[in-house]
């Protein structure tokens, strides 16, 4: 019958682990997107919102081509360790306002943590060190207002798209060279 | 309307450098990114690379990489490819296509640019 | 690179007809929920036309007679019923893997 839902298939092709890594990150690029449009509709944004306590986007001009697996890795870990917090915190403290959008926001975060656990599995079998943040992580208030709480989802959501693009293109870079 | 622009076409001489222009809009230029397909006359289309306009970040088919470069202008909603040490095979044309981040399938295309390389 | 292999290389057909159009990939382009194949249209003189993508997603404006099924290696873009504007040549397209590579092409002409 194979293994049960959910759990990862034993493989020690790193081209085939990488594989599943990539489906889950797609798929979550794609609920991101389609929750980023949800907010857009319910919420209109006006223009680019931001978050000091995001991680800065780990891609730049020349750096892709320049990638290694195990630091591709290790910064999209540390990296969506941050968002998970800040879904986290946007579902326990966005308000009433984000409440209409719980359900989805819920659904983000239970494919954050698979997405978490699949790279934790990926880099344990590639030997690799589960390292820690390097910055300190800054404890995230209660939004301002109500205003402030749309504005801080706006922003997690539009970063975490841009990182899963970022994942998605440098994973399957990174795979053609395996 | 959302619409892609591209620059005209060029006449190029083999070794020499080509840039061609595509502008953006009717939409939020940096939500999706931007891919740079060739068609050259009885070939099959192919994906030289794209880049992601919000972080300036290009990828490119190893077929084209060392020869292809994808730059953007956020400002300007502007994307730029640029071909260098052009040969006859680079006789072609060149479309720019918006790309849905992440899974590579392309729901607006530029008119295309036609560049011929000939002595 | 993966290889996408369409069939027939031409087809003839009356407006009214229906039309089967293949794309078959040199390796599985499907993984659980996703099928990365998409398909365009494109007339001479004019750049390619979304039509379909991730297998079976109706792009935005196009008409409900242009539908895709397939998974796998097996793909299959079908026109109910063929208008006067259909005759073109169409193109499958994956994005499975790095690089996203094309079909050769099937060219739909007016029997």
């Known amino acids: 019958p194979g293994p049960p839902a959910g759990s990862p298939r034993v493989s020690s092709d790193p081209r085939a682990d990488l594989d599943s890594a990539v489906l889950l990150t797609r798929s979550l690029l794609a609920d991101t997107r389609q929750l980023a449009a949800q907010m857009r509709d319910k919420f209109p944004a006006d223009g680019d919102h931001s978050l000091d306590s995001l991680p800065t986007l780990a891609m730049s001009a020349g750096t892709l081509g320049s990638l290694q697996l195990p630091g591709v890795l290790t910064r999209l870990r540390v990296d969506l360790m941050s968002y998970l917090r800040h879904v986290q915190w946007l579902r326990r403290a966005g308000g009433p306002s984000l409440k209409t959008l719980e359900p989805e926001l819920g659904a983000l975060q239970a494919r954050l943590e698979r997405l978490l656990r699949r790279l934790q599995l990926l880099m344990s079998r590639l030997a690799l060190p589960q390292a820690a943040p390097d910055q300190p992580v800054i404890p995230l208030g209660p939004p301002a207002s109500a205003w402030g709480s749309i504005r801080a989802a706006h922003a997690i959501l539009g970063g975490l798209h841009l990182t899963l693009d970022w994942a998605v293109r440098g994973l399957l870079l990174l795979k053609t060279r395996l | 309307e959302v619409q892609l622009v591209q620059s005209g076409a060029e006449v190029k001489k083999p070794g020499a450098s080509v840039k061609i222009s595509c502008k953006a809009s009717g939409y939020t230029f940096t939500d999706y990114n931007m891919d740079w397909v060739k068609q050259a006359p009885g070939q099959r289309l192919e994906w030289i690379g794209d880049?992601?306009?919000?972080?300036?970040?290009?990828i490119y088919n190893q077929k084209f990489t060392g020869r292809a470069t994808l730059t953007v202008d956020k400002s300007a909603s502007t994307a730029y490819m640029e071909l260098s040490s052009l040969r006859s095979e680079d006789t072609a044309v060149y479309y720019c296509?918006?790309?849905?981040?992440?899974?590579?399938?392309?729901?607006?295309w530029g008119q295309g640019t036609t560049v011929t390389v000939s002595s | 690179d993966i290889v996408l292999t369409q069939s027939p290389a031409s087809l003839a057909l009356s407006p009214g007809e229906r039309a089967t159009l293949s794309c078959r990939a040199s390796k599985s382009v499907s993984t659980s929920g996703y099928s990365y194949i998409h398909w365009y249209q494109q007339k001479p003189g004019q750049a390619p036309r979304l039509l379909i993508y991730l297998a079976s997603n109706l792009a935005s404006g196009v008409p409900a007679r242009f539908s895709g099924s397939g998974s796998g290696t097996d793909f299959t873009l079908t026109i109910s019923s063929l208008e006067e504007e259909d005759f073109a040549t169409y193109y499958c397209?994956?994005?499975?893997?790095?690089?996203?590579?094309f079909g050769q092409g099937t060219k739909l002409e007016i029997k």
């Open positions: 296509a918006r790309g849905e981040l992440g899974h590579w399938y392309f729901d607006v």
């Open positions: 880049i992601n306009p919000h972080q300036g970040g290009p």
């Open positions: 397209q994956h994005s499975r893997d790095l690089p996203p590579t």
